[in-house]
Amino acid sequence: IYGGQKAKPGDFPWQVLILGGTTAAGALLYDNWVLTAAHAVYEQKHDASALDIRMGTLKRLSPHYTQAWSEAVFIHEGYTHDAGFDNDIALIKLNNKVVINSNITPICLPRKEAESFMRTDDIGTASGWGLTQRGFLARNLMYVDIPIVDHQKCTAAYEKPPYPRGSVTANMLCAGLESGGKDSCRGDSGGALVFLDSETERWFVGGIVSWGSMNCGEAGQYGVYTKVINYIPWIENIISDFGGGGSGGGGSAKFVAAWTLKAAAHHHHHH
Amino acid sequence: MASMTGWKIHYTSTAHACPYPMAPPNGHVSPVQAKYILKDSFSIFCETGYELLQGHLPLKSFTAVCQKDGSWDRPMPACSIVDCGPPDDLPSGRVEYITGPGVTTYKAVIQYSCEETFYTMKVNDGKYVCEADGFWTSSKGEKSLPVCEPVCGLSARTTGGR
């Protein structure tokens, strides 16, 4: 997180740390699902059980955390790893339910009315242990409040080289300051960009940290997030089809996706 | 030639009557007859909220047949009050006996609730009654447990710390 501040206990109780070759993040849904970015878990597709999932802690290196393991990973069938970041969304089913408390609480999915809290200039909050402006991964969970950026303005920002045309799709939303300095960065991938629903007084996930400019927090460039509201049917279908309850059973973790495997691509928010 | 006629013996027999079937408490015999003889039968029907049991074992129906030696081919079952048994534990919740401590028989009421703050009850209001079929049943007719679903979106940033 660029230009952020340290999170306090209970601020982001849905925050999940995903370790598996690289550092990434996710957000707890219900008590046995994690919402994350497809690119953050793609590299572990052959061994989803190798994902080390940690929650209930502020400190990235702390030995005090709640451990969870993956039972199955579901990558959006429209995600293509070497061709942009459209449909950059994935779900991890945990093999056991986690106990909910003040430090581990799921994030809400957006209601139909949620778009009224996600208009241009509305403030969202990104959190993570990714790179800070000092150039290192954060030891303490960091967060930053950033405004939503007009979609056309964001599309225009990413139409000049080195970005291919059409990088920003309708399945993405952008957030950040035109002047730069506040952004998510490498290592924050998969984490939630959350918004406060002022009617219910509950936080919901509006975006998933996906990609951005080569230099995080760059002026005139913005962080790009998967637009979660576009994927509510996809999320709900998977959760209903593959069960709410963690089985707790043995067996190897499954990796589910509806596409052929392609060569891995790297992007600045991957790690 | 004189005709010969053999002996003619007339047999008469009285079938042994079986003992009169006394209905078990909370049950009745059908059909009711003055007496029951060979091949006659009776069935036992229990009142609502009671079930046929032979010892610990449940029966859906019971019919006994009178045998030639004057005994019934099956012993009389009992009509025992339906017992739904201890309710299942509710993950992230608890159960309270409303009718009385540990009472799990017909028409007994229990109340499920979820752990405060972090869980909320889905599916129904958590009130279940022991019905005549032996299942704990919600007011909506569900025999499955309610669900304690985690409350989402709580944060110390809006609740001023916990």
Partner: antibody
Framework: DVQLQESGPGLVKPSQSLSLTCTVT?????????WNWIRQFPGNKLEWMGY???????SYNPSLKSRISITRNTSTNQFFLQLNSVTTEDTATYFC???????WGQGTTLTVSS | DIVMTQSQKFMSTSVGDRVSVTCKAS??????VAWFQQKPGQSPKPLIY???YRYSGVPDRFTGSGSGTDFTLTISNVQSEDLAEYFC?????????FGAGTKLELN
């Protein structure tokens, strides 16, 4: 004629779950009676494990209650035993039986071993 | 749990003899007792239910008696095919329990 037939894996590793099936022919498991699982240990000791009744209600031996589940599939006329976290002590011959106890399956031998 | 005690692990008999296998319940089980016969490699075969009622097809040389806590299976005119292990079983009270068995052997 009523017949019961058990089927299962034969060998299970410790800490795993055991699943057995009892297939009933000649009588519907929803018509009447309690449909039981009974096991016999080496040395011939018999233990009643539990039953599922014609109505679908279950009753379990309290010694097993935390790890046993008996379910049924009425369309295939089968009932099932699941026993979790097995140990070598669960090595036995498993029988399914209709109660009154008048019909028993032939039994299936289960060995728990690593 | 109700304990069903079959005090004799083995009983010796001869073909044509009359033999009585006994079983004692640790508490009152009414008449809710059954008897089973088991031969090696076979499943238990039901003989008697409700203490004294024979299952259909069971020869009438097998007779059950008793109620409350004391039960007896009597085999009159023992045949060679009767050499087997006999188990008593109570189904009056949860959980259902079995006796340890009595093996009938030839003298």
């Amino acid at each position: 004629d009523v017949q019961l037939q058990e089927s299962g894996p034969g060998l299970v590793k410790p800490s795993q779950s055991l699943s057995l099936t009892c297939t009933v022919t000649g009588y519907s498991i929803t018509s009447d009676y309690a449909w039981n699982w009974i096991r016999q240990f080496p040395g011939n000791k018999l233990e009643w494990m539990g039953y599922i009744s014609y109505s679908g209600r279950t009753s379990y031996n309290p010694s097993l209650k935390s790890r046993i589940s008996i379910t049924r599939n009425t369309s295939t006329n089968q009932f099932f035993l699941q026993l979790n976290s097995v140990t070598t002590e669960d090595t036995a011959t498993y029988f399914c039986a209709r109660y009154w106890g008048d019909y028993w399956g032939q039994g299936t031998t289960l060995t728990v071993s690593s | 749990d109700i304990v069903m005690t079959q005090s004799q692990k083995f009983m010796s008999t001869s073909v044509g003899d009359r033999v009585s296998v006994t079983c004692k319940a640790s508490q009152n089980v009414g008449s809710n007792v059954a008897w089973f016969q088991q031969k090696p490699g076979q499943s238990p075969k039901p003989l008697i239910y409700s203490a004294s009622y024979r299952y259909s097809g069971v020869p009438d040389r097998f007779t059950g008696s008793g109620s409350g806590t004391d039960f007896t299976l009597t085999i009159s005119n023992v045949q060679s095919e009767d050499l087997a292990e006999y188990f008593c079983h109570q189904y009056n009270t949860y959980p259902l329990t079995f006796g340890a068995g009595t093996k009938l052997e030839l003298n």
